[in-house]
């Protein structure tokens, strides 16, 4: 098997990516400048640490989490980094254009980098459903479309529903999941004969995927608290997320054992289920008043995640062509919905408590937000899927799905592994 890129893609990718990068540099040159105000340096460092946590989550956490394929681990990690780097640049510009451009120039702050990293994270969640079936040129398209769709979704939700940064970013779980699933649905499904082994997991890549899960597990409290405006909210968010992910780990490992006839633990279940609590509490992490509630949520989320990992892959593999180990998409879609439902329950309790008879209206607003997120995710995902199917991108042949050798130079290997 040739280790070279197909000649046409070799021309297409560098030209496409470098032209795009040049365009981004020009946009930054003409339309952006740094926040000139002098800040308290200690505060600046503390603020940077939140952004650093998010970058670690994205680059190492999601990068390695998706690297469990036996013959696609290199590509998973490196392509994730590529998408993150590109996604952050475009997200900073887009957020700036959408929120502050009328004033003339986009002011870049640590907060805008934080927002951009979270927007780029959306792509890294979605791409789990298509990694191995697309090349870098196609991934560039996916990054541009998804970041643009998410940016516009956030602006629309912010303007129409008057939601804050945290609330409108927490739709990221549902948005990213449905976007990824709809892109996957558009791509060629069946794995041809002879390539079934490539989408299987192997011990060393599975270990690196577990490393990714551990990084995500450690930094999930930072993700859930990054966009909250007061110290008390951030503190509550950190505590509640921590309790939820702690319980979901215990649930994931014990639930995985329970789900297996011989009581064995599945690596794939554990990779995703350890994060379940963090996703489920995301929307309401700052509002949960007691640790035990966050822990119960972590428990429920862990069970849903393990249950989903047991029963959904068959369906996803048949309908969407998503391999068994790429379970982030449906995992996040279920858990994201759980998180949104929990918030709606809190909303009902709040309006009943206030006794102002606005329950229906408030719930309708929240359901409207969620529906809008799902609809935009599905529509932009389908659009992306259709774009990725264009011949211009020279997509990998089905026989070369999940194969690092299509993209990477391995000097010590003549053919195969």
């Amino acid at each position: 098997m040739s280790s070279k890129y197909p000649r046409s893609v070799r021309r297409c990718l560098p030209l496409w990516a470098l032209t795009l990068e040049a365009a981004l540099i020009l946009l930054f040159y003409f339309f952006t400048h740094y926040d000139a105000s002098l800040e308290d340096q200690k505060g600046l460092v503390a603020s940077y640490q939140v952004g650093q946590d998010l970058t670690v989550m994205a680059a190492i956490g999601l990068g390695f989490l998706t690297s469990s394929f036996r013959r696609h681990s290199w590509s998973s990690v490196a392509f994730n980094l590529f998408m993150l780097a590109l996604g952050v640049q475009w997200a900073i510009l887009l957020d700036g254009f959408l929120s502050q451009f009328p004033s003339g120039k986009v002011v870049i702050t640590l907060f805008s980098i934080r927002l951009a990293t979270m927007s780029a994270l959306s792509v890294l969640i979605s791409v789990d459903a298509v990694l191995g079936k697309v090349n870098l040129a196609q991934l560039v398209v996916m990054v541009l479309v998804e970041v643009t769709a998410l940016g516009n979704l956030r602006m629309v939700i912010s303007n129409i529903f008057n939601t804050d940064y945290h609330m409108n970013m927490m739709h990221i779980y549902v948005f990213a999941a449905y976007f990824g699933l709809s892109v996957a649905w558009c791509l060629p499904k069946p794995l041809p004969e002879g390539t079934e082994d490539k989408d299987q997991t192997a011990t060393i890549p599975s270990l690196s995927a577990m490393l990714g899960a551990l990084f995500l597990w450690m930094f999930w409290p930072s993700f859930n608290s990054a966009l909250l405006r007061s110290p008390i909210e951030r503190k509550n968010a950190v505590f509640n997320t921590y309790y939820a992910v702690a319980v979901s780990v215990v649930t994931a490992i014990s639930g995985s054992s329970l789900a297996h006839p011989q009581g064995k633990i599945s690596k794939t279940y554990v990779h995703s289920a350890v994060l379940a609590g963090g996703v489920a509490v995301g929307t309401s992490c700052h509002l949960i008043p007691s640790p035990w509630l966050a822990m119960v949520l972590g428990l429920v989320a862990g069970l849903i995640s393990v249950g989903g990992a047991k029963y959904l892959p068959g369906c996803c593999n048949r309908v969407l062509g998503i391999p068994h180990s790429s379970i982030m998409g449906y995992n996040f879609s279920l858990l994201g919905l759980l998180g949104e439902i929990i918030y709606i329950v809190l909303l009902v309790l709040d309006t009943v408590g206030a006794g102002n008879g606005m329950i229906g209206f408030q719930v309708l607003l929240s359901i409207g937000e969620l529906s809008l997120a799902i609809v935009i995710a599905l529509m932009s995902g389908l659009l992306t899927g259709l774009l990725l199917n264009l011949k211009i991108w020279k997509a990998p042949h089905e026989a070369k799905y999940f194969d690092d050798q299509v993209f990477w130079k391995f000097p010590h290997l003549a053919v195969g592994f």
Partner: antibody, heavy 125, light 105 residues
């Protein structure tokens, strides 16, 4: 005693710059988001700008976007408002105010609980 | 945009006074009421549409959610003659109503 004291106001020509300061006492500034609010003579209150507790995020009213910059130095317990390209319509009393966050069941509620006495800015040629 | 009505009203001591504030779009319960006396800084009365700030007399009350809100003074006292402002804190850019001046009849 919790107090906010503004300073830096005065008479300035259109197009020039001015920097307002607000020193907090009786509480730790780094635990609170802060705001600037102004009131033109004989007119109502107008929110000007806000900054998060850690300085990571800043928001501005459309009327001052691109001209005014809010910043803070938590180590000195001080809030700033840098005003550039001043116009006659920026003439007002400028108040700094502390934001309080209270948890409701489904969202946090924010309001300004402590206000300074204000400093007067007059933009005139 | 926050629209307050009336812009001014005359009332006597002991009267029940109601001021309304309407938001151009839903702000849920993110509405606060402030009182300002001439030459003084504003003072918060009600936050989150209906919660009374500590130290504020119980004759002040707030109601509403979504787009329509009211501030009620159940029995007007001499010290209540002032200008009242509503303010939304729902979006990242806060806005005030234009104010309602309560004068002695």
């Amino acid at each position: 005693q919790v107090k906010l004291l503004e300073s830096g106001g005065g008479v300035v020509q259109p197009g020039r710059s001015l920097r307002l300061s607000c020193i907090a006492s009786g509480f730790t500034l780094r635990n609170y988001a802060m705001h600037w609010v102004r009131q033109a003579p004989g007119k109502g209150l107008e929110w000007v700008a806000g900054i998060w507790f850690d300085g990571s995020n800043k928001n501005y009213a459309d009327s001052v976007k691109g001209r005014f910059t809010i910043s803070r130095d938590n180590s000195k317990n001080t809030l700033f408002l840098h005003m550039n390209s001043l116009r006659a319509e920026d003439t007002a009393t400028y108040y700094c105010a502390r934001e309080r966050a209270i948890r409701g069941i489904s969202r946090y509620n924010y309001y300004m609980d402590v206000w300074g006495k204000g400093t007067t800015v007059t933009v005139s040629s | 945009v926050m629209t307050q009505s009336p812009s001014s009203l005359s009332a006597s001591v002991g009267d029940r006074v109601t001021i309304t504030c309407r938001a151009s779009q839903s702000i849920r319960s993110s509405l606060n009421w402030y009182q300002q006396k001439p030459g003084k800084a504003p003072k918060v009365l009600i936050y989150a549409a209906s919660s009374l700030q500590s130290g504020v007399p119980s004759r002040f009350s707030g109601r509403g959610s979504g787009t329509d809100f009211t501030l009620t003074i159940s029995s007007l006292q001499p010290e209540d003659f002032a200008t009242y402002y509503c303010q939304q804190s729902s979006s990242s850019s806060w806005t005030f109503g234009q104010g309602t001046k309560v004068e002695i009849k």
